[in-house]
């Protein structure tokens, strides 16, 4: 019947669209994976350095506290709050040093997270442009198929054609706006 003919003719166009979209998405995933690996490799030395410094600070803190602990154990009569007063500056010093290391790490990592965000934004922009062009192409093909069919079965298909074209158009619009929304979200992070 007319409907099965229509399905036959539209089938390859729809399938081609989804196949291409899948390829585009897979390409984006692989490129992003590569970007992440590159950034990780650049960042790793800073993380290793941060861990080493953190361990050193902990070790120094233990050494500085040990004389106080030893004296207390040996029976030096000392009120608890006096001990806390002595420990407090050491704790503050360690916290300040740790904060300095964290700040240094944050400073080192900032350019890489920006770079990653920009790369992803560029990839999505490219996908949006390619996707938009392809959707227009499929839209044209579908229109052409419908026109050919409608010559043969004009009365039966006219209503169907009128209903289907807006559906394709709205799919195109919603696909592009979803991509646009994701790009915006990415840029505001």
């Amino acid at each position: 019947s007319t409907f099965s003919k229509l399905r036959e003719q539209l089938g390859p166009v729809t399938q081609e669209f989804w196949d291409n979209l899948e390829k585009e998405t897979e390409g984006l995933r692989q490129e992003m994976s590569k970007d992440l690996e590159e950034v990780k490799a650049k960042v790793q030395p800073y993380l290793d350095d941060f861990q080493k410094k953190w361990q050193e600070e902990m070790e120094l803190y233990r050494q500085k506290v040990e004389p106080l602990r030893a004296e207390l154990q040996e029976g030096a009569r000392q009120k608890l709050h006096e001990l806390q007063e002595k420990l407090s500056p050491l704790g503050e010093e360690m916290r300040d040093r740790a904060r300095a290391h964290v700040d240094a790490l944050r400073t080192h990592l900032a350019p890489y997270s920006d770079e990653l965000r920009q790369r992803l934004a560029a990839r999505l922009e490219a996908l949006k442009e390619n996707g938009g062009a392809r959707l227009a192409e499929y839209h044209a093909k579908a229109t052409e198929h419908l026109s050919t069919l409608s010559e043969k079965a004009k009365p039966a298909l006219e209503d169907l054609r009128q209903g289907l074209l807006p559906v394709l158009e709205s799919f195109k619009v919603s696909f592009l706006s979803a991509l646009e929304e994701y790009t915006k979200k990415l840029n505001t992070q």
């Epitope: 050193e56 070790e59 233990r62 050494q63 040990e66 004389p67 602990r69």
Partner: nanobody
């Protein structure tokens, strides 16, 4: 357990220098962090300086620029070079380390700075 023995203490005039040594023996599998502390009569025992396995050093503000800690890993010995000594540096100086949460202390060596 690690055994620590200090030496090199003595009587010195203000402005003078002394070099303390701390020899470690026992089970030492790596270069542990080694430290010096001191205690004057009637005073709190205080941390003076440390040298980490990496070679990094740290000093109490009161001795910065005057004292230098160093180590000889081959002989398991730590040194404390004390220059421009002041009367307030007079104390018993102890060498110590904390290995796997276990502290080990030497018996101490007396340093007296007096004219």
């Amino acid at each position: 357990q690690v055994q620590l023995v200090e030496s090199g203490g003595g009587l010195v005039q203000p402005g003078g220098s002394l070099r303390l040594s701390c020899a470690a023996s026992g089970t030492i599998t790596r270069s542990p962090t080694m430290s010096w502390a001191r205690q004057a009569p009637g005073r709190q025992r205080e941390w003076v300086t440390s040298i980490l396995g990496t070679g990094r050093t740290d000093y109490a503000d009161s001795v910065k620029g005057r004292f230098t800690i160093s180590r000889d890993n081959a002989n398991n010995t730590v040194y404390l070079q004390m220059n421009n000594l002041k009367p307030e540096d007079s104390a018993v100086y102890y060498c110590y380390t904390v290995l796997n949460g276990r502290p080990s202390w030497g018996q101490g060596t007396q340093v007296t700075v007096s004219s």
